[in-house]
């Protein structure tokens, strides 16, 4: 999160997270500015001349949707300033002189999660935004799966699923005869060879995907796919 010291009696803490494509969602902790003040955040690119993007706060939140030509790249770097009007005059305070979107990533959840049941196993596949495909090797997934009648808190988890958009669940991991549900979330992976800490992508898990339901297959011998395990 990004903390900006305000001009008033209380400081403001802003958290701005990006989906690593075209959207930056910001949330702030001190929305009480009075009626009609219409505060906003201004993102000014430290690299692209004239690259400014306005984020108008509604309550405690705002969203910037960047133009298509400004799709986020790893080296992007913004100055964030907070603007509001008091007594008819615009007040400006610095929130962050060097906001690096790659350090504040919250991706959109994976989409189109599907199951394909065959003898002895279930193959799960999913999709990511085409805009993220160049970063496939940087994406890490976590799978949660459970019997349909169970709460998600009871789900089994599998993580460290990196760089693939499929997964095999063996029948022995599931309860035969029961309908199961699975869901998935994604984050930027921390790679072993990322020796320069400043260059890493960091952030948090996406929201969970829409779940998929499937009937557990009958148990047989383990399947070893020709392409190896993920």
């Amino acid at each position: 999160s990004v903390t900006g010291e305000g001009q008033g009696p209380r400081s403001r803490t802003f958290t701005c997270l990006t989906n690593n494509i075209l959207r930056i969602d910001c949330h702030w902790s001190a929305p009480e500015l009075g009626q009609g003040s219409s505060p906003w955040l201004l993102f000014t690119s430290n690299q692209a001349p004239g690259g400014t993007h306005k984020c108008i706060l509604r309550g405690s939140e705002c969203t910037v949707v960047l133009p298509p030509e400004a799709v986020l790249v790893p080296s992007d770097n913004f100055t964030i300033t907070f603007h509001h009007c008091m007594s008819g005059r615009e007040q400006v305070s610095l929130v962050d002189p060097e906001y690096l979107p790659r350090r504040h990533v919250k991706l959109d959840p994976p989409s189109d999660l599907q199951s394909n049941i065959s003898s002895g196993h279930c193959i799960l596949t999913w999709s990511i935004s085409p805009a993220l495909e160049p970063m496939t090797t940087l994406l890490s997934y976590e799978l949660a799966f459970k019997k349909q009648e169970e709460a998600w808190e009871q789900a089994q988890h599998r993580d460290h699923i990196v760089g693939v958009t499929w997964l095999i669940l063996e029948a022995f991991e599931l309860d035969p005869g029961f309908i199961h549900e699975a869901r998935l979330r994604v984050q930027m992976a921390t790679l072993e060879d990322d020796v320069v800490e400043e260059e890493r992508y960091t952030g948090q898990w996406s929201e969970w995907s829409q779940p998929v339901c499937f009937q557990a297959p009958q148990r047989q011998g383990p399947l070893i796919p020709p392409w190896g395990w993920p």
Partner: nanobody, 125 residues
């Protein structure tokens, strides 16, 4: 910031060959689509060729198809343009560009965020 440095330009006779290189700095080179553009004197900068981040897709202007080949080596952070059967009308300054393809196609300059300084290619008849 991604920095791009072109090399390999020069003077060549018509029918000859040149290989341009573009060396990129930056940790995430393999996430960028790369393109070559050129600008002849008195003309606008035009698309020549492009290659996707992993190298699996390539794109060419009609005027260079079959003569030019774009390739990349992500381990070396370098993209190449092999130019064969050069013609006098290929004379131009050649620019390397890097961008994250999203909305606009690889032939559009607006797709590219970073540009090199250019290398001169002169084809004499």
């Amino acid at each position: 910031q991604v920095q791009l440095v072109e090399s390999g330009g020069g003077l060549v006779q018509a029918g000859g060959s040149l290989r341009l290189s573009c060396a990129a700095s930056g940790r995430y080179f393999y996430t960028y689509g790369m393109g070559w553009f050129r600008q002849a004197p008195g003309k606008e900068r035009e698309f020549v060729a492009a290659i996707s981040n992993e190298g699996g897709s390539t794109y060419y202007a009609d005027s260079v198809k079959g003569r030019f080949t774009i390739s990349r080596d992500n381990a070396k952070n370098t993209v190449y343009l092999q130019m064969n059967s050069l013609k006098p009308e290929d004379t131009a300054v050649y620019y390397c560009a890097a961008g994250r393809w999203y909305y606009y196609g690889p032939e559009y300059q607006i797709t590219y965020r970073y540009w090199g300084q250019g290398t001169q290619v002169t084809v004499s008849s």
